[in-house]
Interface confidence: low
């Protein structure tokens, strides 16, 4: 049994991580990650460590954070290697050829590993209450841990699409992640959302020669706004467009441009939106073949009972507090995955809006295998 990810996320470096709560042996955890097109995760220093810590801290798993949990990671000491008491990893090593950071910049050991130069030993990440990383702990490979961490490496990623009027965002990544938010999405990720009127829309991240882009995205937002303003990618009204310092914090929707007053949007002859910041607004790049001038489309959701009210208030476009994400047209409900991963700096944003990683790795295939969610 390979449950879907409890939580996952991607950083701009092209690396994605997923955390799973499932009692299993080390080999089974490895296989579960491979089935998703990834590998058991390394948790090296710096960005990688921060990303994994963010996943853990996003919330407890089964049990509600009442006990310490152990997660399999790609850390082991091979049979012929000795315990090294003065080394940060105590003679253990990461099972990948990733260029690592300083090994000294790592978590501490919860318990010192047994001295040995003969037996192969595995290690787990122990999390206090299931959320606060305590450190590494030696564990026999045939024993069962409470969960595991997978890592996936991609050449390009799609930046999160701007919601506009969309609510109920649901991300389905190729490594069987269902989530309410992803800062960056690998090719194959499908984003479903509800536009006004509970009408669903779906777009997919695809990779081509230029980079990664959202296929079937009609314009620059998931759902067009009824008004003229967007703030942080979501529809807004003019009164909500001033920041704490009184600056104009909105951008103009497609078909409008910043007025001469610098704090309102007027009908645009060009039809190009402009970005308004707290300083001087800057113009968005013109539409290209990969980011066409928006045209409204009208997808639909029809899985409500007659006379029922919508599941989500149409004006509340928050994507981090939705308890459940239904798959359109199905009876089952997937659990929402909370994410909170910071974007890292090892990436370039292309004119088409995709993220091209400057970081290459042999950790896993750049094209993850699909994993049937019916067995998840």
């Amino acid at each position: 049994e390979h449950p879907t990810a409890d939580r996952a996320g991607c950083s701009a470096s092209g690396a994605c991580y997923s955390l799973h709560h499932a009692t299993m042996k080390r080999q089974a955890a490895e296989e579960a990650c491979i089935l998703r097109g990834g590998a058991l995760s390394t948790v090296r220093a710096g960005a990688e460590l921060r990303a994994v810590l963010a996943l853990l801290r996003a919330g407890p798993g089964p049990g509600g954070g009442s006990k310490d949990l152990l997660f399999w990671v790609a850390l082991e000491r091979r049979r012929s290697h000795c315990t090294l008491e003065n080394e940060p990893l105590r003679g253990f090593s990461w099972l990948s050829s990733d260029p690592g950071g300083l090994e000294s910049d790592t978590l501490q050991w919860v318990e010192e590993p047994q001295r040995s130069c003969t037996a192969r030993r595995c290690a787990v990440l122990q999390a206090t209450g299931g959320v606060e990383p305590a450190g590494w702990k030696e564990m026999r490979c045939h024993l069962r841990a409470n969960g595991y961490l997978c890592k996936y490496q991609f050449e390009v990623l799609c930046p999160a699409p701007r919601p506009g009027a969309a609510s109920n965002l649901s991300y389905r990544a190729p490594f069987q992640l269902h989530s309410a938010a992803l800062d960056f999405s690998p090719p194959g990720t499908e984003v479903s959302a509800l536009c006004r009127g509970q009408l669903p829309i779906s777009v997919t991240c695809i990779a081509d020669e230029i980079g990664a882009r959202w296929d079937k995205l009609s314009g620059d937002v998931l759902c067009p706004c009824p008004g003229r303003y967007l703030r942080a990618g979501k529809c807004a009204e003019l009164p909500n467009c001033l920041d704490d310092l009184g600056g104009f914090a909105c951008e103009c929707a497609t078909g409008f441009e910043l007025g001469k007053d610098g704090r309102s949007c007027v009908t645009s002859g060009e039809g190009q939106p402009t970005l308004g910041g707290t300083g001087v607004p800057t113009r968005r790049p013109p539409a290209t073949a990969t980011s066409p001038v928006p045209q409204r489309t009208w997808p639909i959701r029809v899985d409500e009972k007659l006379g029922e009210t919508p599941l989500v208030p149409e004006q509340d476009n928050s994507v981090t507090s939705i308890p459940e994400i239904p798959r359109w047209g199905s009876q089952s409900t997937m659990s929402t995955l909370q994410m909170s991963l910071q974007a890292e700096s090892k990436a370039t944003i292309t004119p088409s809006g995709s993220v091209i990683s400057k970081f290459n790795s042999t950790t896993s295939s750049a094209t993850p295998q699909a994993f049937d969610s019916s067995s998840a």
Partner: antibody
Framework: EVQLLESGGGLVQPGGSLRLSCAAS????????MSWVRQAPGKGLEWVSV????????YYADSVKGRFTISRDNSKNTLYLQMNSLRAEDTAVYYC??????????????WGQGTLVTVSS | QSVLTQPPSASGTPGQRVTISCSGS????????VNWYQQLPGTAPKLLIY???NRPSGVPDRFSGSKSGTSASLAISGLRSEDEADYYC???????????FGGGTKLTVL
Amino acid sequence: EVQLLESGGGLVQPGGSLRLSCAASGFTFSGYYMSWVRQAPGKGLEWVSVIYSGDGSTYYADSVKGRFTISRDNSKNTLYLQMNSLRAEDTAVYYCARGLNSSSALPFDYWGQGTLVTVSS
Amino acid sequence: QSVLTQPPSASGTPGQRVTISCSGSSSNIGSNAVNWYQQLPGTAPKLLIYADSNRPSGVPDRFSGSKSGTSASLAISGLRSEDEADYYCGSWDYSLSAYVFGGGTKLTVL
């Protein structure tokens, strides 16, 4: 009781125009999404257009885009379909249909009896 | 040619169970809910099943809908003469950005 009554159909020459109306009663018209669906003689159903309840946003099937305009007058509880540049293939019975509920445009839970539009020279 | 494929005709005797299929693709039935409409001779269509398997009030439980993958089906048990009508399936199609209907199935009660 929910009632939808279409009118305005008739015979028109190719290239001509026609305006269909749909008078609604028995429900809060302004709160519902409304659509037009047509059916050519002896053929199947074809969705034509929809209009939102709130801001009046409109959407059209590719076959009528640029030629047909859907609109509504909430004060009169009436839905309209302005049809320009009519073609022979637009000949059909035009039904006005109500969306499932006040927050869903589909499916169509109530239909009018239809009005026949014939485009012929 | 309709986007959703239905058999043009189906028949059965009173009391029998008849099934009408509706085949689509991942961009319509595979992604979105299926609705079924009944059109009695000379009348407007009527919503029979919505969201794959739900019956609006007033529709007898002899009518049931189901969906699997990119196909859906409407089952009518205990067939009656008044069930003789045209039946249409409908679903939203993401790639076409349109609501699409099947070509319709004419049900004859023998």
